[in-house]
Amino acid sequence: QAGPLPKPTLWAEPGSVISWGNSVTIWCQGTLEAREYRLDKEESPAPWDRQNPLEPKNKARFSIPSMTEDYAGRYRCYYRSPVGWSQPSDPLELVMTGAYSKPTLSALPSPLVTSGKSVTLLCQSRSPMDTFLLIKERAAHPLLHLRSEHGAQQHQAEFPMSPVTSVHGGTYRCFSSHGFSHYLLSHPSDPLELIVSGSLEDPRPSPTRSVSTAAGPEDQPLMPTGSVPHSGLRRHWE
């Protein structure tokens, strides 16, 4: 007896983080034997949608012409072949931005920081929110989470960086999110440029010297210096 059908691949174009009102296409790719594709959305009646395969039958397209809150969430897809249904795909988390107005991102004491010193990025919301996310542009793992515990909402989250090195430099934005759904994010904050200058103790590497061997914020989470200032907030990384 043949083993289980291989799971399909699920992805979104142009990406899985979509601004409110923009279009997004979800693709599910199975095998050439697929006869039907099914898309399930977590906490929605299954199936969320069904599509016939596109030629040459190894994938199907699920179109969202205008992104709204209803489409944000966690999806899986399946395909049906003559021998039955496949295993589910790995989940796709479709996130919508623009659900809330933008927070304010600042650097304390300053966005100009000397290598080896400390800096704290502060994301502030004028209304209470329960999750704050810090994103660095062009980072492999850009999300740093601060999420409140016990539903206690906060107006701000602090992201300490210490000691700062040249790889911390770059452009950051933050988002905030409400308890309604963690798939709904605010508009992005205005960008903050963090500029790291060298010091006598820790000279800035020359352009010819590789710094990729030192794990920076792109490669591993920034560990907090001491406790998170707002006790209702718990630190998470993704």
């Epitope: 709204t68 623009g98 809330y100 107005s101 304010t104 004028r126 409400h178 508009h187």
Partner: antibody, heavy 120, light 110 residues
Framework: EVQLVESGGGLVQPGGSLRLSCAAS?????????ISWVRQAPGKGLEWIGS?????????YYATWVKGRFTISRDNSKNTLYLQMNSLRAEDTAVYYC???????????WGQGTLVTVSS | DIQMTQSPSTLSASVGDRVTITCQAS??????LAWYQQKPGKAPKLLIY???TLASGVPSRFSGSGSGTEFTLTISSLQPDDFATYYC????????????FGGGTKVEIK
């Protein structure tokens, strides 16, 4: 020109209802702003009524004294904000303003105000 | 709740005087404080935001200072056009607030 224009004020009897409108021009209510309603009774100070977030979810917050009598809503297609006022009392007589919270968290744009008089 | 207490409620002064108005928050509001000027029959006008930043078009005789819970609006040399009522306001929005404004300070001619 960037502006807010209130309308819908007038004379209403105690216990009655009224809906005020705040039309935005020169910017979109669905961009990243909060909009508040503020009132000022004759000879008194400014009093915050409530606010609505321009994000798609449209979170609203109200002053504690509102106690469900007032409701803020919006119609993005008309770029207009509303204040529905029910169970009106004489002490609700005031000039009602809508105002935009800028990036600096301050009210950087105000309407001209509309007068609501609650009297029998 | 965040209460904003403004003082004095009335201030009598003369042209050329240095005038100081204070605003106290019942808990820290960081630097999220704004000051407004209002004249009879008109909407309030933003003077200062983020405690100390002058709004566009506001004369430099106006200045703001403070952070946390104590804030000050100063008019270095009072001009005839400055006789008005001034309000402070914190920038937070949430459901446990009675008001976001201070009670106001009327600056009148001595």
């Amino acid at each position: 020109e960037v502006q807010l224009v209130e309308s819908g004020g007038g004379l209403v009897q105690p216990g009655g209802s009224l809906r005020l409108s705040c039309a935005a021009s020169g910017f979109s209510l669905s961009s990243s702003y909060w909009i508040s309603w503020v009132r000022q009774a004759p000879g008194k100070g400014l009093e915050w009524i409530g606010s609505i977030d321009s994000g798609s979810v449209g979170i609203t917050y109200y002053a504690t004294w509102v106690k469900g009598r007032f409701t803020i809503s919006r119609d993005n297609s008309k770029n207009t904000l509303y204040l529905q006022m029910n169970s009106l009392r004489a002490e609700d007589t005031a000039v009602y303003y809508c105002a935009r919270h800028g990036d600096n968290w301050a009210l950087d744009l105000w309407g001209q105000g509309t007068l609501v008089t609650v009297s029998s | 709740d965040i209460q904003m207490t403004q003082s004095p409620s009335t201030l009598s002064a003369s042209v050329g005087d240095r005038v100081t108005i204070t605003c106290q928050a019942s808990q820290s509001i960081n630097s999220w404080l704004a000051w407004y000027q209002q004249k009879p029959g008109k909407a309030p006008k933003l003077l200062i935001y983020k405690a100390s930043t002058l709004a566009s078009g506001v004369p430099s005789r106006f200045s703001g200072s403070g952070s946390g819970t104590e804030f000050t609006l100063t008019i270095s040399s009072l001009q005839p056009d400055d006789f008005a009522t001034y309000y402070c306001q914190h920038g937070y929005i949430r459901g446990d607030l009675d008001n976001v404004f201070g009670g106001g300070t009327k600056v009148e001619i001595k």
